[in-house]
């Protein structure tokens, strides 16, 4: 399911429960996706020892995965709500091609991988409603994404395992950073 349990309109409208605010819905959605990533990481970590490797050992890769930096306005120092929100949405849009790549990478967690992908699309929609400056958000080029996807899928098995691990770890870190920032807004 792309939305966490208790998030559909029937549940939200239930008389015993207060409807979630926009911020609460976003917060819950991110936590739901993080739980999904955690399940996917369990499968990848059981298959290889990459999860124990230090970041430096895995740093040499040609993936251009979105990453939070000081200039993005999402950290405690130099925090800027609008700049940060643009970075979060832009980053999530950039991650979409990598989430597509993950779709055929799991045996026992195929549905979980799909749920993470669909939930991220829903999260992007929630955040776009929150953002005032939608013009500042750049959408990735579909042609570039298609060729990147083809290139990633053509890698040998070891590189594909490494890519899967790096995507999950980077996406987890990006979402955790986003959550910390959104909780300050």
């Amino acid at each position: 399911a792309p939305v966490p349990p208790g998030e559909d309109s029937k549940d939200v409208a239930a008389p015993h429960r207060q409807p979630l605010t926009s911020s609460e819905r976003i917060d819950k959605q991110i936590r739901y996706i993080l739980d999904g990533i955690s399940a996917l990481r369990k499968e990848t970590c059981n298959k290889s020892n990459m999860c124990e490797s230090s970041k430096e050992a895995l740093a040499e890769n040609n993936l251009n995965l979105p990453k939070m930096a000081e200039k993005d306005g999402c950290f405690q120092s130099g925090f800027n709500e609008e700049t940060c929100l643009v970075k979060i949405i832009t980053g999530l849009l950039e991650f979409e091609v990598y989430l597509e790549y993950l779709q055929n990478r799991f045996e026992s967690s195929e549905e979980q991988a799909r749920a993470v992908q669909m939930s991220t699309k829903v999260l992007i929609q929630f955040l776009q409603k929150k953002a005032k400056n939608l013009d500042a958000i750049t959408t990735p080029d579909p042609t570039t994404n298609a060729s990147l996807l083809t290139k990633l899928q053509a890698q040998n098995q070891w590189l594909q395992d490494m890519t899967t691990h790096l995507i999950l770890r980077s996406f987890k870190e990006f979402l955790q950073s986003s959550l910390r920032a959104l909780r300050q807004m």
């Epitope: 990481r41 230090s54 430096e56 999402c74 405690q76 910390r180 909780r183």
Partner: antibody, heavy 120, light 110 residues
Framework: EVQLVESGGGLVQPGGSLRLSCAAS????????VTWVRQAPGKGLEWVGI???????AYATSAIGRFTISRDNSKNTLYLQMNSLRAEDTAVYYC??????????????WGQGTLVTVSS | AIQMTQSPSSLSASVGDRVTITCQAS??????LSWYQQKPGKAPKLLIY???TLASGVPSRFSGSGSGTDFTLTISSLQPDDFATYYC????????????FGGGTKVEIK
């Protein structure tokens, strides 16, 4: 053995500086969030600051502008640079590890602590 | 800024007693609360995280409950090894806060 060991504590004058170290063994520090927590003599625990996987940091209000957390991944060591020290900074300083697998901060591995005394 | 208020600050109890310690957050922190035990001269030890999940190796006489702003740590049958100071800690947000920990509860022998 998986452990954290703090060092660098000692006596320092008010207004002075000190750098504490937290050496990790048995695991790669770069894979974890690491926090500093202090405890003044006879008092409770006080959270000081944290460094996340992306070198993002956050600090308690009392530490902002005076304390800086950094790490040297090649040495598998975390640092707490403390400037403009005051008498109220006197405490045992602990570093602690958060497994960073979830979104909430919780500290499941602690060092033994190092004592910092600020006095003239 | 989130503030954590723990009560009582100290309590006296006997071996075998049921002990309850409460912790209140100044705003909702979901279930993002941990409990620690600390003995004199030692580092704190994680007991419970996510409000109710027992940390590895922690005896089942310890339990945690609560969500939102109100949380409880319960020791079902106090043992000699349990006389210590207990702290709650919010893990919801570590930005713009004075302290992530509650003030502590010292459990003493009656």
């Amino acid at each position: 053995e998986v452990q954290l060991v703090e060092s660098g504590g000692g006596l320092v004058q008010p207004g002075g500086s000190l750098r504490l170290s937290c050496a990790a063994s048995g695991f790669s520090l770069s894979n974890y969030y690491v926090t500093w927590v202090r405890q003044a003599p006879g008092k409770g625990l006080e959270w000081v600051g944290i460094i996340y996987g992306s070198d993002e940091t956050a600090y308690a209000t009392s530490a902002i502008g005076r304390f800086t957390i950094s790490r040297d991944n090649s040495k598998n060591t975390l640092y707490l640079q403390m400037n403009s020290l005051r008498a109220e900074d006197t405490a045992v300083y602990y570093c602690a590890r958060d497994d960073s697998s979830d979104w909430d901060a919780k500290f499941n591995l602690w060092g033994q602590g190092t004592l910092v005394t600020v006095s003239s | 800024a989130i503030q954590m208020t723990q009560s009582p600050s100290s309590l006296s109890a006997s071996v075998g007693d049921r002990v309850t310690i409460t912790c209140q957050a100044s705003q909702s922190i979901n279930n993002e609360l941990s409990w620690y035990q600390q003995k004199p001269g030692k580092a704190p030890k994680l007991l419970i995280y996510r409000a109710s999940t027992l940390a590895s190796g922690v005896p089942s006489r310890f339990s945690g409950s609560g969500s939102g702003t109100d949380f409880t740590l319960t020791i079902s049958s106090l043992q000699p090894d349990d006389f210590a100071t207990y702290y709650c800690q919010q893990g919801y947000s570590l930005r713009n806060i004075d302290n992530a920990f509650g003030g502590g509860t010292k459990v003493e022998i009656k």
